[in-house]
Interface confidence: low
C-alpha cells in the first residue's frame, strides 16, 4: 500500500521537511502533490511526468518545494502556514490513480523568554505578586523554577493562564529568591534570565545587644539595636521617654547611677509603613571595685570516667558587678555541644566528659577596669578497659 512519512514530523520554523514515499508502484506514468487531504487542482503543488522527467509547478507552489524522481517532496524554509496535510496522487501506467496522505506540524523557534511582574517590591504578609512569562505563544509549554529547583508545592503558589503566570499570594521574605521561566515546544526550548524578587518586610521586633542589664559606674554604655528589615529600617532611641539620636548604636561614656532607667529602641520601615520597638532597663551600680579579687575553681570531681561521667566546674568570687569567662588549653569556652554555661557563666558543665576534655581549666573574672584569673585546675579523664570479645 502506498504511504507517506514526514521527516521530521515536528519541524522548526525555517527548517526543512521531507515527505518520503513508501511502496511506490513499479509502472508509473507520473505523480502529483497537493496541499490538503484530497486531490484538488487548485491546491496542486507540483506534478511530475516520468517519461520526460519534467516537474510542473501548480497553483499552490511557493518556490520552496523540490520533487524527486522517487516522488519524495522536499519543502524548505517552512513556515507555520505549511502545517497540515499533504496528498500524493500516483498515476500508474494504466492511468489508475492511487493516493496517500501525510502531514507535519511546524512549530516556531522560541525566543529567549523574559519575566514581567505586576509588583517589583511586594510587602511581606500583605501583597501578592504575579510573574508572567513573556511572550505569549501558541502550542507552547511554560515552566517555572525557583532557585534552580522546580516549583515547591504550596497553597500560596498558583499557576494560571496556561502556566504562563505564576502568582505568589501573601508573599514572605523567604520568597525573595531567583525566579526563572522556561518555554518549550516540540522543537525548541529556552529559559529566561533569573529575576530576584525583592520582598519588603519588617521591621521585626528589635534586639538590643549586649544583653547585660547591670553596669558599673565608670563603664561605657554601648548599646546596639538590630531589627530584620528590608529595606534597612530607621533607628531611634529614647531614654526614660526622652528622644535621643537617630542612630543604630547608642553610646554613653562613663555612666553613673544617673543613667539608670528605660532605654527604648524604635525602628521604622518607610517602605512597609510598619514600626516596632523594644524597651530595656539599665541599672548602674554606685561603686566600682577597682581591683577584682582572684577567683577560685571548685570542681564536683577532678578525675572522671570518659563517656560516662559529667563534671561541674564553679568559678567562685566575692566581687559583684563582674563578668566571667572560661578557658581550656588557651581556648575560650564553651567549645562543644557538651559544654554548657549557667548562673551567669559561674558554672561550667561538661556532660558527658570525653577524652579530649582532659587538661587544665581556669576562669577569669573582669569588670570594665580590671580582671583576674583563677589558678588552673586539672581534669583527668579515665576510660574503663573494654571487656574482651570471645
Amino acid at each position: 500500500q502506498l504511504t507517506t512519512e514526514s521527516m521530521p514530523f515536528n519541524v522548526a520554523e525555517g527548517k526543512e521537511v521531507l515527505l518520503l514515499v513508501h511502496n511506490l508502484p513499479q509502472q508509473l506514468f507520473g505523480y502529483s502533490w497537493y496541499k490538503g487531504e484530497r486531490v484538488d487542482g487548485n491546491r496542486q503543488i507540483v506534478g511530475y511526468a516520468i517519461g520526460t522527467q519534467q516537474a510542473t509547478p501548480g497553483p499552490a507552489n511557493s518556490g520552496r518545494e523540490t520533487i524527486y524522481p522517487n516522488a519524495s517532496l522536499l519543502i524548505q524554509n517552512v513556515t507555520q502556514n505549511d502545517t497540515g496535510f499533504y496528498t500524493l496522487q500516483v498515476i500508474k501506467s494504466d492511468l489508475v490513480n492511487e493516493e496517500a496522505t501525510g502531514q507535519f506540524h511546524v512549530y516556531p523557534e522560541l525566543p529567549k523568554p523574559s519575566i514581567s511582574s505586576n509588583n517589583s517590591k511586594p510587602v511581606e504578609d500583605k501583597d501578592a505578586v504575579a510573574f508572567t512569562c513573556e511572550p505569549e505563544a501558541q502550542n507552547t509549554t511554560y515552566l517555572w523554577w525557583v532557585n534552580g529547583q522546580s516549583l515547591p508545592v504550596s497553597p500560596r503558589l498558583q499557576l494560571s493562564n496556561g502556566n504562563r503566570t505564576l502568582t505568589l499570594f501573601n508573599v514572605t521574605r523567604n520568597d525573595a529568591r531567583a525566579y526563572v521561566c522556561g518555554i518549550q515546544n516540540s522543537v525548541s526550548a529556552n529559559r529566561s534570565d533569573p529575576v530576584t524578587l525583592d520582598v519588603l518586610y519588617g521591621p521585626d521586633t528589635p534586639i538590643i545587644s549586649p544583653p547585660d542589664s547591670s553596669y558599673l559606674s565608670g563603664a561605657n554604655l554601648n548599646l546596639s539595636c538590630h531589627s530584620a528589615s528590608n529595606p534597612s529600617p530607621q533607628y531611634s532611641w529614647r531614654i526614660n521617654g526622652i528622644p535621643q539620636q537617630h542612630t543604630q548604636v547608642l553610646f554613653i561614656a562613663k555612666i553613673t547611677p544617673n543613667n539608670n532607667g528605660t532605654y527604648a529602641c524604635f525602628v521604622s520601615n518607610l517602605a512597609t509603613g510598619r514600626n516596632n520597638s523594644i524597651v530595656k532597663s539599665i541599672t548602674v551600680s554606685a561603686s566600682l571595685s577597682p581591683v577584682v579579687a582572684k577567683p577560685q575553681i571548685k570542681a564536683s570531681k577532678t578525675t572522671v570516667t570518659g563517656d560516662k561521667d559529667s563534671v561541674n566546674l564553679t568559678c567562685s568570687t566575692n566581687d559583684t558587678g563582674i563578668s566571667i569567662r572560661w578557658f581550656f588549653k588557651n581556648q575560650s569556652l564553651p567549645s562543644s555541644e557538651r559544654m554548657k554555661l549557667s548562673q551567669g557563666n559561674i558554672t561550667l558543665s561538661i556532660n558527658p566528659v570525653k577524652r579530649e576534655d582532659a587538661g587544665t581549666y581556669w576562669c577569669e573574672v573582669f569588670n570594665p577596669i580590671s580582671k583576674n584569673q583563677s589558678d588552673p585546675i586539672m581534669l583527668n579523664v579515665n576510660y574503663n578497659a573494654l571487656p574482651q570479645e570471645n
Epitope: 511582574s117 532557585n147 534552580g148 529568591r177 531567583a178 534570565d193 533569573p194 529575576v195 530576584t196
Partner: antibody, heavy 121, light 111 residues
C-alpha cells in the same frame, strides 16, 4: 569558604588545543553557573561563556563559538574550558568564576587564580 | 550585545582625594528597577576583585569608602578618600543579558 583552584600555566603551539580546569570547593557547583573570562596581556577582561553544571547546558560568545567548549564534572566539582585552533592572540590569562543566586548574588564575587596560556611557535 | 563605556580611561589623583568613575551602558541593564551592573578592582598579576554588586551593594570585606550608584544606563563608582592601595584598574560589568560584557577599564594612577 569558597575556593577555586585552576590548573597550571601552559605553553602551546598555534593550531593546537588547551584544556584548563577549575576545581571548586565550599559550595555546590550545581547551584551556580560557571563562567570563563580571559585577559590578554595589557588588555581588559573578556567574557567567553558559561555552563550550567546542573544540566550541562553551555553558552558561548559568538566570537568563540566553534572553538571553545565548556564542560563540568559535578562529581569532582570541576569545570573545564577547552579552546582549540589556538592562535597567538589567544595568549591570555584565563579565569573561572562561579555566578548565581547562592554563591555570588549574580555577580562574580569569587575568581580562580588564573591560568596563563601562551601560544607561540 | 550591551556595550559598556567607561570614563575616563585614566584618572590621576592623589591619596586623600575623591575619585569618581563612570560606566555608561548602550541600553538599560535594569531588571525590575535594579541595575545588574557590578564593579571590580584589579591589580597587576591578580584576579579581579568584586567591589560593588548590583549597582550599589558593597561586597563582603569592601571598605565603606567605596560606593556605587546609578540605574538604567548610567552608573558611578565613588571612592570618597583615596588610600594608596586603591590605585589599580577598575572594570564595570553587566549581567543583565548574554554576553556578560565588561567595560574597557579605568586606570586610577597616583598623581
Amino acid at each position: 569558604q569558597v575556593q577555586l583552584v585552576q590548573s597550571g600555566a601552559e605553553v602551546k603551539k598555534p593550531g593546537s588545543s588547551v584544556k584548563v580546569s577549575c576545581k571548586a570547593s565550599g559550595f555546590n557547583i550545581k547551584d551556580t553557573y560557571m563562567h570563563w573570562v580571559r585577559q590578554a596581556p595589557g588588555q581588559g577582561l573578556e567574557w567567553m561563556g558559561r555552563i550550567d553544571p546542573a544540566n550541562g547546558n553551555s553558552k558561548y560568545v559568538p566570537k568563540f563559538q566553534g572553538r571553545v567548549t565548556i564542560t563540568a564534572d559535578t562529581s569532582t566539582s570541576t569545570a573545564y574550558m577547552e579552546l582549540s585552533s589556538l592562535r597567538s592572540e589567544d595568549t591570555a590569562v584565563y579565569y573561572c568564576a562561579p555566578f548565581g543566586y547562592y554563591v555570588s548574588d549574580y555577580a562574580m564575587a569569587y575568581w580562580g587564580q588564573g591560568t596563563l596560556v601562551t601560544v607561540s611557535s | 550585545e550591551i556595550v559598556l563605556t567607561q570614563s575616563p580611561a585614566t584618572l590621576s589623583l592623589s591619596p586623600g582625594e575623591r575619585a569618581t568613575l563612570s560606566c555608561r551602558a548602550g541600553e538599560s541593564v535594569d531588571i525590575f528597577g535594579v541595575g545588574f551592573l557590578h564593579w571590580y578592582q584589579q591589580k597587576p598579576g591578580q584576579a579581579p576583585r568584586l567591589l560593588i554588586y548590583r549597582a550599589s551593594n558593597r561586597a563582603t570585606g569592601i571598605p565603606a569608602r567605596f560606593s556605587g550608584s546609578g540605574s538604567g544606563t548610567d552608573f558611578t563608582l565613588t571612592i570618597s578618600s583615596l588610600e594608596p592601595e586603591d590605585f589599580a584598574v577598575y572594570y564595570c560589568q553587566q549581567t543583565n543579558e548574554d554576553p556578560y560584557t565588561f567595560g574597557q577599564g579605568t586606570k586610577l594612577e597616583i598623581k
